[in-house]
């Protein structure tokens, strides 16, 4: 078990009235054990809507480091290397779950938090608004 | 919170020796409350590397519904609507955290799990391997 000296002000994990809480085993199970995917590998460079990865760091959050995609261009890269501004590079976003200590500094009490992250970029045809 | 009838045989969340566990508040805080983005909105249709969204549902997991992207084509869609097979549509993948009920069907006991999901697709220049 976890033997931690209780911090004053921290929630009592034995309290039956602890609001909307559950017990979570932090020993992460990996569903993708067969391979060690290089995830989106070097797509950020080879894409027609290339992106840069920026480090978003917060030591009070898990995971502490999240890599955020920022599209390099407004348009999309053509075969000749030039940017086509008739097309748009746009971020593909996803809501992910993270853990945050709550109250802060309490060793065994956390809150789930949902954050929106940009994972990469894709090239789309723009929506053209015709003025009457 | 999650209101599920307690099953016998489920771990007692008040047990101090509950292995490697912490209390997690499921009253999710959303860091992106200022807007309600349609996230990747209709990009899946407008992209030069369009994708279909498949519903992956698992009542033993939180979130129970995850939308998985599957690229529609091997190649990328050109301005005339035809597919260019000199380019590749590829999935942008990301590892995310989810909660899984463990033991199964227990209302207040979960385990962190890491899964790889495809969020959308992007159009990339292929890597050409030259044979000597």
């Amino acid at each position: 078990g976890i033997a931690i000296p209780r911090n004053s002000g921290c929630p009592n994990s034995e309290d039956k009235n602890f609001p909307r809480t559950v017990m979570v085993n932090l020993n992460i199970h990996n569903r993708n054990t067969s391979t060690n995917p290089k995830r989106s590998s070097d797509y950020y460079n080879r894409s027609t809507s290339p992106w840069n990865l920026h480090r978003n760091e917060d030591p009070e959050r898990y995971p502490s480091v999240i890599w955020e995609a920022k599209c390099r261009h407004l348009g999309c890269v053509k075969a000749d290397g030039n940017v086509d501004y008739h097309m748009n590079s746009v971020p593909i976003q996803q809501e992910i779950l993270v853990l945050r200590r709550e109250p802060r500094h309490c060793p065994n009490s956390f809150r789930l938090e949902k954050i929106l992250v940009s994972v990469g970029c894709t090239c789309v045809t723009p929506i053209v608004h015709h003025v009457a | 919170g999650i209101a599920i009838p307690r099953n016998s045989g489920c771990p007692n969340s008040e047990d101090k020796n509950f292995p490697r566990t912490v209390m997690v508040n499921l009253n999710i805080h959303n860091r992106n409350t200022s807007t309600n983005p349609k996230r990747s909105s209709d990009y899946y249709n407008r992209s030069t590397s369009p994708w279909n969204l498949h519903r992956n549902e698992d009542p033993e997991r939180y979130p129970s519904v995850i939308w998985e992207a599957k690229c529609r084509h091997l190649g990328c869609v050109k301005a005339d609507g035809n597919v260019d097979y000199h380019m590749n549509s590829v999935p942008i993948q990301q590892e995310i955290l989810v909660l899984r009920r463990e033991p199964r069907h227990c209302p207040n006991s979960f385990r962190l799990e890491k899964i790889l999901v495809s969020v959308g697709c992007t159009c990339v220049t292929p890597i050409v391997h030259h044979v000597a």
């Epitope: 992460i28 480090r55 995971p63 502490s64 | 890491k114």
Partner: antibody
Framework: QVQLQQSGPGLVKPSQTLSLTCAIS??????????WGWIRQSPGRGLEWLGR?????????DYAVSVKSRITINPDTSKNQFSLQLNSVTPEDTAVYYC??????????????WGQGTLVTVSS | DIVLTQSPATLSLSPGERATLSCRAS???????LAWYQQKPGQAPRLLIY???NRATGVPARFSGSGSGTDFTLTISSLEPEDFATYYC??????????FGQGTKVEIK
């Protein structure tokens, strides 16, 4: 099988620059799921992390505060290696220097592969 | 910087005995970023445990890790002759903070 092979001089004069190289086989210095670091060990200081580099669409450097003003870690993609330079060395920099691969998977962080270590003595 | 304090400095035990090594952080750290290493004289450290409780590839089941917050433990259930070595805990908190404990030497009694 990933291996790290260290090279560099074992003796450096005070005020000069310590230079070590770590050659990678079985992985790429530009890997998007690893970082490449230097750690040193001396009887007085124990194990001390010095810094790391990682590539995520551009190169990122992180250096320990204790050596930040004197250290540079550079990648060499053509040779698939990375190097450590520590300027203005003093006898306190005498240590065994290790290069290591840091698994940097967002969800975990640890050194799974280590070089063989190089004893560097700073003395005139 | 976060300080990791390992105790005891030296543990004198016999083969077959149980070893319990402690690593205490000066403030809360994420267990996911805590690791344990074994080092023998003249060798580089070897990864034993990552994420506070996950055994690295090839590490025998007699090694186990646990803990959360500020207190972490490495347990060797039954010491084998090859387990006599020095053990270090390490944690990554945030850039550029990656720290090691000062080590616990497990020696033959």
């Amino acid at each position: 099988q990933v291996q790290l092979q260290q090279s560099g001089p074992g003796l450096v004069k005070p005020s000069q620059t310590l230079s070590l190289t770590c050659a990678i086989s079985g992985d790429s210095v530009s890997s998007s799921s690893a970082a490449w670091g230097w750690i040193r060990q001396s009887p007085g200081r124990g194990l001390e992390w010095l810094g790391r580099i990682s590539y995520r669409s551009k190169w990122y450097n992180d250096y320990a505060v204790s050596v930040k003003s004197r250290i540079t870690i550079n990648p060499d993609t053509s040779k698939n290696q990375f190097s450590l330079q520590l300027n203005s060395v003093t006898p306190e920099d005498t240590a065994v220097y290790y290069c290591a691969r840091e698994v940097d998977s967002t969800y975990y962080s640890y050194f799974d592969i280590w070089g063989q270590g190089t004893l560097v003595t700073v003395s005139s | 910087d976060i300080v990791l304090t390992q105790s005891p400095a030296t543990l004198s035990l016999s083969p077959g005995e149980r070893a319990t090594l402690s690593c205490r952080a000066s403030q809360n750290v994420w267990a996911f970023y805590l690791a344990w290493y074994q080092q023998k004289p003249g060798q580089a450290p070897r990864l034993l445990i990552y994420g506070a409780s996950n055994r690295a590839t090839g590490v025998p089941a007699r090694f186990s890790g646990s803990g959360s917050g500020t207190d972490f433990t490495l347990t060797i259930s039954s010491l084998e002759p090859e387990d006599f070595a020095t053990y270090y805990c390490t944690q990554y908190y945030s850039s550029p903070s990656l720290t090691f404990g000062q080590g616990t030497k497990v020696e033959i009694k």
